[in-house]
Interface confidence: medium
């Protein structure tokens, strides 16, 4: 299953499959997730070790049992791969690291005015993997405002050094934010020239293309089909690069297929997994396990659930079957691809779906009428769970925010439906940043069911929570994916990095904003909050947030939207924007429904086959 917990001051001993330099534990975890054999990782921050060579060291590990002995090491951070973690799987990494220089091959230098501009240049350059930016206060005047675009053989820095007034980060191409655009065409009977960066076996050109997309140095590829004239080269997928970023030449060649990495696609990237099943094909590899199952789909599910399994073959040979069940061979290799592909067999083969973003249909949990005032513009994919709840009675308008918590579920505030409980009139827009981008052709979700908390009463602040079941499940993308929910009764976690987002008013008597706004707001204790709202009861099922001096807050139109906090590198939905006295007033914090207190209710409603059957009318 999916394990998200991080172990502080702990280091996994043994099991090493790769090592690299990464700026933090989260990036190390992402590299582990995408490494075909990595199940566990350990990271050494600069503060944890004196050995300069091991600072920022990221150690990727495998284990037959799925675990390794942990040894105490002050400052070290260890954890699990996010394989099998559905929507949490992403190669996108937005963080900017201050005081850190990520070293690599510097292939381009230019003067820019900000680190964001430097990151944008890297994202818009086909070969750039990461960058460093010297700020205006850098000690050498001639280097100030320099933006260095970089790459390395493995896609990670060749070294990371602590250096004042330098900021570093990664290309946002894996966030589907590149302005370059991509070539979707597949070219039949054409072979590309240039440098081979890797060679793997794949059953078709589409798997080859996906592998190229997620390989740090692949820009284009050539695939040799299973009828290619040289037997030893059949099903070979050659991952390629070139100085210019495009093939320098191409040769007409029977039974070859070529194409490009899709990493530079804007707004949508292919999933980092291969779901197709190949009948009449055997995949060879190291045997992990053999089990009897009924049907090839069950074989794929079995492979997906066994975290080390990379691909499988389901045999229909009479000697491999008994009654209705046949042998399911679960296999793996060093690079995650079959070591041999055979055609015309009585088997069917395919890959594990452990890296698919879709995950299951449940809501995301972890194992353990109110624009934002004082906020700033958000960027694409920054808050991919944020949705806009709009009403189309006559003119269409944004009324509330909401949070995507599963393929078919949105969490919002009950008061959004006061006087408008009709599911027909609502339209739910997800994966958007600007409200002005919504046209008559913009897809939206319709509501199948509105589930208002049974104890919510109109015009009262209590139990201000509602679930929306969508008519059809949504696919997850970099711009549209769910927020994880907190653990039930989560009271021990101290959240210090919390944000409220929405399109609501920018002042008390304002108007709905076009660009999604964000504001960083500190949580306030319930005791402190109660002092500020002596006419109301602040219950333990509420959470408050705001600055003593005011100036930053949620406001009308943000209601139902998320209050999210980042803890151990993971965002969680801590609150639902509910109410407050005015907006951003001094000593008047915003009041939010505390999601952790409603976990039983959320899970009951989302996991029951028919929420309606258990829905009670508001008491």
């Amino acid at each position: 299953g999916c394990l998200t917990q991080l172990y502080e001051n702990a280091f996994f001993r043994g099991g090493d499959v790769a090592s690299m330099y990464t700026p933090n534990a989260q990036y190390c975890q992402m590299r582990c997730t995408f490494h075909p054999r990595c199940l566990l990782f350990s990271f050494l921050p600069a503060s944890s070790i004196n050995d300069m060579e091991k600072r920022f060291g990221c150690f990727l590990k495998d284990s037959v049992t799925g675990t390794l002995p942990k040894v105490h090491r002050t400052g070290a951070v260890s954890g699990h791969s996010l394989k099998q973690c559905g929507h949490q799987i992403s190669a996108c990494h937005r963080d900017i690291y201050k005081g850190v220089d990520m070293r690599g091959v510097n292939f381009n230098v230019s003067k820019v005015s900000s680190v964001e501009e430097c990151q944008k240049r890297c994202t818009s350059n086909i070969r750039c993997q990461f960058f460093s930016y010297a700020t205006q206060t850098f000690h050498k005047a001639e280097y100030r405002n320099n933006c260095l675009l970089k790459y390395s053989p493995g896609g990670t820095p060749t070294a990371i050094k602590v250096l004042s007034n330098v900021e570093s980060g990664f290309s946002l191409k894996p966030c589907a934010l590149s302005e370059i655009g991509c070539h979707m065409n597949i070219f039949q009977h054409l072979a590309f020239s240039d440098v081979d960066v890797a060679r793997v076996l794949t059953p078709d050109a589409f798997v080859c293309r996906t592998i190229c997309t997620y390989h740090p140095n692949c820009l284009f590829f050539t695939f040799y089909t299973n009828v290619w004239k040289i037997e030893s080269q059949r099903n070979v997928c050659l991952l390629k690069t070139s100085e210019s970023g495009t093939p320098s030449s191409s040769t007409p060649q029977e039974n070859t297929i070529s194409g490009y990495s899709l990493l530079t696609c804007k707004r949508t990237l292919p999933e980092p997994c291969h779901s197709k099943i190949y009948p009449g094909v055997d995949f060879g590899g190291e045997e992990l396990n053999v089990t009897f199952v009924k049907g090839v789909n069950v074989c794929q599910e079995t492979c997906t659930k066994m975290i080390r399994c990379q691909f499988f073959t389901y045999s229909l040979l009479p000697e491999d079957c008994k009654e209705e069940k046949c042998k399911c061979f679960l296999r793996l290799s060093m690079d995650g691809s079959p070591t041999r592909i055979a055609y015309g067999t009585q088997g069917s083969s395919g890959y594990s779906l452990r890296l698919c973003n879709t995950g299951d249909n449940s809501v995301c949990t972890t194992k353990t009428s109110t624009r934002i005032v004082g906020g700033t513009n958000s960027s694409w994919g920054e808050w991919p769970w944020q949705v806009s709840l709009q009403v189309k009675l006559t003119a269409q308008r944004h009324l509330c925010g909401g949070s995507l918590i599963g393929h078919q579920w949105v969490l919002t505030a009950a008061h959004c439906f006061d006087g408008l409980p009709l599911q027909d009139v609502w339209r739910i827009y997800s994966g958007i940043l600007n409200l002005s981008d919504i046209t008559k052709d913009t897809p939206f979700s319709q509501i199948k069911e509105i589930i208002i908390h049974q104890n919510y009463k109109v015009s009262e602040g209590n139990h201000d929570i509602a679930l929306i079941k969508l008519q059809a499940p949504l696919n997850y993308t970099e711009f549209q994916k769910p927020i994880c929910l907190p653990s039930k009764g989560d009271t021990s976690t101290i959240y210090t990095n919390c944000w409220v987002t929405g399109w609501g008013f920018s002042k008390e008597k304002g108007e709905i904003q076009n660009i999604l706004q964000k504001v960083n707001i500190p949580l306030v204790t319930n005791e402190e909050c109660q002092k500020r709202y002596q006419d109301y009861k602040i219950t333990q099922r509420m959470v408050c947030a705001g600055y003593k001096e005011g100036g930053k807050d949620a406001c009308k139109g943000d209601s139902g939207g998320p209050l999210v906090c980042k803890h151990n590198g993971m965002w969680r939905l801590v609150g639902i924007t509910s109410w407050g006295e005015g907006c951003a007033r001094r000593e008047q914090p915003g009041v939010y429904t505390k999601v952790a207190e409603y976990m039983d209710w959320i899970l009951e409603k989302t996991q029951s086959s028919d929420g309606k059957a258990q829905m009670q009318s508001p008491a």
Epitope: T394, A395, Q396
Partner: antibody, heavy 117, light 107 residues
Framework: EVQLLESGGGLVQPGGSLRLSCAAS????????MHWVRQAPGKGLEWVSS????????TYADSVKGRFTISRDNSKNTLYLQMNSLRAEDTAVYYC??????????WGQGTTVTVSS | DIQMTQSPLSLSAFVGDRVTITCRAS??????LNWYQLKSGKAPKLLIY???SLQSGVPSRFSGSGSGTDFTLTITSLQPEDFATYYC?????????FGGGTKVETK
Amino acid sequence: EVQLLESGGGLVQPGGSLRLSCAASGFTFSLYLMHWVRQAPGKGLEWVSSIYSSGGFTTYADSVKGRFTISRDNSKNTLYLQMNSLRAEDTAVYYCARDTDYGMDVWGQGTTVTVSS
Amino acid sequence: DIQMTQSPLSLSAFVGDRVTITCRASRDISVYLNWYQLKSGKAPKLLIYGASSLQSGVPSRFSGSGSGTDFTLTITSLQPEDFATYYCQQSYSIPFTFGGGTKVETK
């Protein structure tokens, strides 16, 4: 092909009733807001009534409120207008129309209702 | 209710002429304004939605402009098939209301 086809019009006496139907084809009827619009002889277009996708919300022009009822059967891809207590001023060609976010993009050919003694 | 006032009531023009029809709303309707063409015995046809967006399949000689209260439909080069009655309609608030229509006749 996306199509709307009205039926049920005819001659009726004042105070009488009539039920108009509109059969939809070529699109997912259950996803669309639908309207009835009419045009009286020598006059302009007049919006009559609307119904939201699942039928849970309806709205009417003041001139027909309380007398006309709009409904739909999504399983049959059909829109209806039940017209009671008909008056001479209800004489018109009645059109059904499909709604997009902004306008009515698909219309039927119309069915004629004549209210006369 | 929002009143929609169309002008002129009718106009005569030659094939090839540039024709402009205006529509005024009694209050701000943003861009929730649509234009329709109606020929006798035929179904009305949506030409322009959202004040300025051309409905697919409609010739580019038709264009719409305006927002708030004042809107215009322009036919840049009138064709024989364009002789018809044109209606504006607001979809900003219920009741949806149409303008009185403008009949475009041949000179």
